[in-house]
């Protein structure tokens, strides 16, 4: 028994010594993010071992003081997602004694309203600004230099609109030295680690990116005021290209920023003539009007390997040639706004003319290979006979290393229906708790409710689908009961309300004229039933004195109403 593997924080990482009791997990955050929660978790012993605390998260703080700032990054809250409204964040950067600071603009994206980024050459809000997003339309590609050891960064957002915000990279540097260069989506090598005058730096881009603007090699010059002789280059994912490497990456234009609309890009990937190409499409998030097409050859007339629109999860393609042509056409009408919208394709040169081992048949199912020879790229699909379901992966692919992508699946009988659920105002009788084929569920409505639909459902096998109930669950509807017929008011009395029909559950009230008293129930109720009926016979009004009674009734005492005629709702 062990603890579960702790969740890696977004914009951070975790290292685990052991998942068994006594083991520990240590968390740390990427530059610009701060850990919220415990830095260190311990796996505690129990019947089910557990971590002694919740996994922490990495958050971009709204402001802070960074003393002894050597190299690092500050990012707006939520980055690379959008910041929130009504923020006022202040960061104070302070370089070690005797050093100055350089700032690189990694990304600045503010909403086009009253959101603002100001960078001040000093240590407080009054210091003179060296960058103000209100004043400057374009970011200075060479970045910013402090005159002293401080930079003061202010980010303020209003109550409307939001964007990705900002990521700034800072580097402290000594007098007589140049600042540490930076290239987004790339790397560099330096002739000396502290960048004194005379240092040369050579830049390269991450796979899939191309060096643009600036120079590949720059040099730290001018002993009086050390500076780089050229602007640092930029690495961009470009639209189109010819690639002859044995492995590499093709990225959507501008990745991970959104690609532009109305683009038509073509990449050619070429490997050695006797080799083939495995395409590993790791990210595919394009719009429904955008098209990514793979051609099995070196131009657009070759056989289409696959054509895709919209999002799709990780998949692989294999060519039958030594060339592949990738075409991406983005919809001119709609623009994609999201970060990391686009595609990431890794490609590898793979050997040809080899096959994966033969796969066996499986009980209660069959297999269908995509082609007779089990060469890399062949897909074998396993299916089960009706009433059976695939356990494991139904699709196995012969990989470039000539192993199958998944273990062999099996076919297990689907033997039960899902729980049909409770029905309001009813109870149910279940023949078997897990609803196997043949199980029945009987619904019995509560008193006062009538059943609409089938009272008994039976679980049946099906030919193509898994087992299903013979009918949908019924409903229990409130019973519509017949009303009681109105009773006449007693002689020398009155009734309320004076209606002909009274709904089940209704009550009528009786009263007598002055000088008369009520004999019987003053209120009687219409009792629901089949048929509905009055709860009591109607009362009579009797004179308060016997003389008055005889005078008023003229000795007509035998005329009390027949009980049966007034109690039955059917009359």
């Amino acid at each position: 028994l062990s603890c579960h593997f702790p969740r890696r924080p977004a914009y951070g990482d975790v290292t685990v010594t052991s998942l068994h009791p006594g083991g520990s997990a240590r968390f740390h955050c990427a530059t610009g993010y701060q850990l919220k929660g415990a830095r260190h978790l311990t796996c505690l012993n129990a019947t089910q071992p557990f971590w002694d605390s919740k996994e922490p998260v990495c958050i971009a703080a709204c402001g802070g003081v960074i003393r002894n700032a050597t190299t690092g990054r500050i990012v707006s809250p939520g980055f690379p997602g959008n910041y929130s409204n009504n923020l006022t964040c202040h960061w104070l950067l302070e370089a070690p004694e005797g050093q100055r600071l350089h700032l690189h603009f990694e990304k600045v994206s503010l909403a086009e309203d009253d959101d603002r980024l100001i960078i001040r050459n000093g240590d407080n809000v009054e210091a003179p600004p060296v960058y103000d997003s209100y004043e400057v339309e374009y970011l200075p590609i060479e970045g910013l230099l402090s005159s002293g050891k401080h930079f003061f960064v202010e980010l303020s957002t209003d109550s409307s609109g939001a964007a990705a915000g900002m990521a700034l990279r800072y580097e402290a540097f000594q007098q007589g030295h140049c600042y540490e260069p930076f290239v987004k989506y790339g790397n560099f090598s330096s002739s000396t680690p502290t960048y004194p005058v005379g240092t040369t730096v050579e830049f390269s881009c991450d796979p899939g990116y191309t060096l643009e603007q600036g120079s590949i090699i720059i040099e730290c010059v001018d002993p009086h005021d050390p500076q780089w002789n050229e602007t640092e280059p930029a690495c961009r994912a470009v639209c189109s290209g010819e690639i002859t490497d044995s492995a590499g990456v093709v990225l959507s234009p501008n990745w991970p920023e959104p690609y532009g609309r109305g683009q038509d890009c073509i990449w050619g990937v070429h490997v050695e003539e006797d080799k083939r190409i495995m395409l590993d499409i790791r990210v595919l998030r394009i719009g429904p009007g955008d098209v990514l097409t793979f051609y099995d050859g070196d131009d657009l007339t070759a056989r289409v390997l696959g054509q895709y629109s919209g999002p799709r999860s990780h998949f692989k393609l294999f060519t039958s040639m030594a060339d592949v042509t990738i075409q991406f056409q983005s919809d001119p009408g709609t623009s994609v706004l999201g970060y990391q919208q686009g595609f990431v394709i890794h490609f590898f040169e793979v050997p040809r003319n080899d096959t994966c081992p033969e796969l066996p048949e499986i009980p209660n199912g069959w297999k269908s290979p995509s082609q007779p020879e089990l060469v890399h790229g062949t897909v074998v699909t396993y299916q089960c006979y009706p009433g059976y379901q695939v356990v494991g992966s139904s699709v196995l692919m012969c990989q470039w290393d000539l192993t199958w992508s998944e273990d062999l699946p099996s076919c297990q009988r689907v033997t039960s229906c899902h729980d049909p659920g409770d029905v309001e105002h009813s109870r149910r009788l279940i023949s078997s708790p897990k609803f196997p084929v043949g199980a029945t569920v009987q619904y019995i409505c509560d008193q006062g409710f009538v059943l609409m639909g089938s009272s008994i459902l039976t679980c049946h096998d099906r030919q193509a689908g898994s087992p299903k109930w013979s009918d949908r669950a019924p409903k229990c509807l409130l019973e519509q009961l017949k009303p009681c017929h109105g009773l006449s008011a007693p002689e020398n009395g009155a009734r309320s309300p004076e209606k002909q029909l009274h709904p089940a559950g209704a009550t009528i009230h009786f009263s007598c004229a002055p000088g008369y008293v009520l004999k019987g129930q003053a209120s009687i109720k219409c009792v629901p039933g089949h048929p509905s009926h009055w709860s009591d016979p109607p009362p009579i009004c009797r004179a308060a004195s016997l003389d008055g009674f005889y005078n008023s009734r003229s000795l007509d005492v035998a005329k009390a109403p027949a009980a049966s005629s007034t109690l039955d709702a059917a009359h």
């Epitope: 299916q383 009706p386 196997p436 084929v437 043949g438 039976t458 679980c459 049946h460 096998d461 099906r462 030919q463 193509a464 689908g465 898994s466 299903k468």
Partner: antibody
Framework: QVQLQQSGAELVRPGASVTLSCKAS????????MHWVRQTPVHGLEWIGG????????VYNQKFKGKVTLTEDKSSSTAYMEFRSLTSEDSAVYYC?????????WGTGTTVTVSS | DIVMSQSPSSQAVSVGEKVTMTCKSS????????????LAWYQQKPGQSPKLLIY???TRESGVPDRFTGSGSGADFTLTISSVQAEDLAVYYC????????FGSGTKLEIK
Amino acid sequence: QVQLQQSGAELVRPGASVTLSCKASGYTFTDYEMHWVRQTPVHGLEWIGGIDPESDNTVYNQKFKGKVTLTEDKSSSTAYMEFRSLTSEDSAVYYCTRGDWYFDVWGTGTTVTVSS
Amino acid sequence: DIVMSQSPSSQAVSVGEKVTMTCKSSQSLLNSRTRENYLAWYQQKPGQSPKLLIYWASTRESGVPDRFTGSGSGADFTLTISSVQAEDLAVYYCGQSYNLFTFGSGTKLEIK
């Protein structure tokens, strides 16, 4: 009300393929299997195969395996049957029909004539 | 495959008469777990698509007149029309769903 609307009549050459469609309306498409049945004077009613739109699982009459592919499109509540390598023996009225254990709704039928 | 045999292949009766047709399967259609017979009866009038009359061997589909009655269990089934009407002129098919689906060859009902 529940309806199954089938595509129009087809006249095809021997060896060709044909794809018939069946658009369902008036019920939740994924709640029932969709089957295909054909009718000829010689063989009467013959069950071809069925698809469960919820899982895309298909089942076929052994006689038509490899000759027929059943598919569906949940977004348009439409079932499709692709029939390949047609011969004159395949001239028939083709019905789509809804049902799990019995066929309670039948399509209008599509007449397929295979002739050179 | 389960084979379904229907008899007679055709039958002519007068309006108001009672008619009985039979359907035999090559194996039992009674599912011991669900206790149902997986047999249905269909009516096909000239120029029309088939229509479901009876399922589970004896349950009448809603809207079907009560002169139509299904009976039987296991491998022997009967469809009875208690008093034939002119609009009952049709071919009647039985069909099983115990193992995949197969239909009988039909009984043609003609009105004298």
